[in-house]
């Protein structure tokens, strides 16, 4: 293929719930991805795999199969949700996320996503990594790009 461009746009929404007994945080994070087909023919997106890391620990994974086909010189915006769990050795975060005295409980998460297209039996994978702020203290809907976390670890595109 000429090229298939994948751009991670950002977090669209984060829905939070807690287990008080287990001091566990459940975050359902919906992300937005733009996939652009620069070829002069349609391509099929076979799957999208995603994972979320907090403090270098994987806290959630998701996989979407048989997503879509994208026409030539066209772009599709795809939303995907990763269920995440912050628990056990990270249960100290429960206190921070449920602290009433602060308004915004932002934590930095690393979003990793891999898009797989198949071309006559040959798979092509394109990956992206982005650091994002997510509020673990309340349900939040974000403007696209609003949750981006910029630091030296995150190469700019």
């Amino acid at each position: 293929p000429r090229s298939i461009d994948v751009k991670y746009i950002g977090v669209k929404s984060a829905y939070v719930s807690y287990d008080v007994q287990k001091r566990t945080i459940y975050l359902n994070i919906t992300n937005t991805l733009n996939i652009t087909n620069n070829n002069y023919y349609s391509v099929e997106v076979e799957n999208i795999t995603a994972q979320v890391q907090f403090a270098k620990t994987v806290i959630g994974k998701a996989r979407l199969n048989n997503i879509t086909h994208i026409g030539p010189l066209d772009m599709k915006q795809i939303d995907y949700t990763v269920p995440t769990v912050i628990a056990e050795e990270m249960s100290y975060m429960y206190d921070f996320c449920t602290l009433i005295s602060i308004k915004v409980h932002n934590i930095v998460l690393m979003m990793q996503v891999t898009v797989t297209t198949t071309y006559f039996g040959h798979s092509e994978q394109i990956s992206q990594e982005r650091y994002q702020y997510v509020d673990c203290g309340r349900n939040t809907t974000y403007q696209l790009g609003q949750s981006e976390y910029l630091n030296v670890l995150q190469p700019q595109q």
């Epitope: 023919y41 026409g71 030539p72 006559f120």
Partner: antibody, heavy 122, light 107 residues
């Protein structure tokens, strides 16, 4: 039957611009690509660029970036090519061409318009 | 850009004769090649796509083939309407590029 009907011949002053139209009929306009090709008098063919009328997505030959702008109007099944800052080098016949495609396959340039002659002269 | 070198640039032949036109690709283009015919009034039509597939309505005397990086258009028995211009087109990569053309003239 498939037809690509192009606008008539143009005589244009240097430095101005021209918009050539290509009206498609006999098929679903947004299911195919439209490409544009240049042919200077007595010379060969040169690819300008391509547009997907469904998405509006375009790709250009580097040589024609800034010179040609491709657009399409789905409601009238018409593709357009605007040429700007015209010089004598732009005097040519311009063809619009339909291209078909599938998943991972392309069968380009199956139907051609009749061509539009653009003459740049003061 | 991929260069398509077409030969000969002109060819004189007689009615009923068998002729072959050739295009050589500067890079691998697989089977991504068309042959086009241009009439004196400027009308262009595709004769062959994907190296060897004949377009509907095109007479069977036209055929396409490939040997390595050389692509051929063969006309098995020339008829009067075949004495026009022919071009090859590669569509393996962008920008699409054309051969310089062959003018087929009656001897």
């Amino acid at each position: 039957q498939v037809q690509l009907q192009q606008s008539g011949a143009e005589l244009i002053r240097p430095g101005t611009s021209v918009k050539v139209s290509c009206k498609a009929s006999g098929y679903a306009f947004t299911d195919y690509l439209i490409e544009w090709v240049k042919q200077r008098p007595g010379q060969g063919l040169e690819w300008i660029g391509v547009i997907n009328p469904g998405s509006g997505g375009t790709n250009y030959n580097e040589k024609f970036k800034g010179k040609a702008k491709l657009t399409a109007d789905k409601s009238s099944s018409t593709a357009y090519m605007q040429l700007s800052s015209l010089t004598s080098e732009d005097s040519a016949v311009y063809f619009c061409v339909r291209s078909s495609y599938g998943v991972y396959v392309a069968y380009p340039m199956d139907y051609w318009g009749q061509g539009t002659s653009v003459t740049v002269s003061s | 850009d991929i260069q398509m070198t077409q030969s000969p640039s002109s060819l004189s032949a007689s009615l009923g004769e068998r002729v072959s036109l050739t295009c050589r690709a500067s890079q691998d283009i697989g089977s991504n090649l068309n042959w086009l015919q241009q009439e004196p009034d400027g009308t262009i039509k595709r004769l062959i796509y994907a190296t060897s597939s004949l377009d509907s309505g095109v007479p069977k005397r036209f055929s396409g083939s490939r040997s390595g990086s050389d692509y051929s258009l063969t006309i098995s028995s020339l008829e009067s309407e075949d004495f026009v211009d022919y071009y090859c087109l590669q569509y393996a990569s962008s920008p699409r590029t054309f051969g310089g053309g062959t003018k087929l003239e009656i001897k």
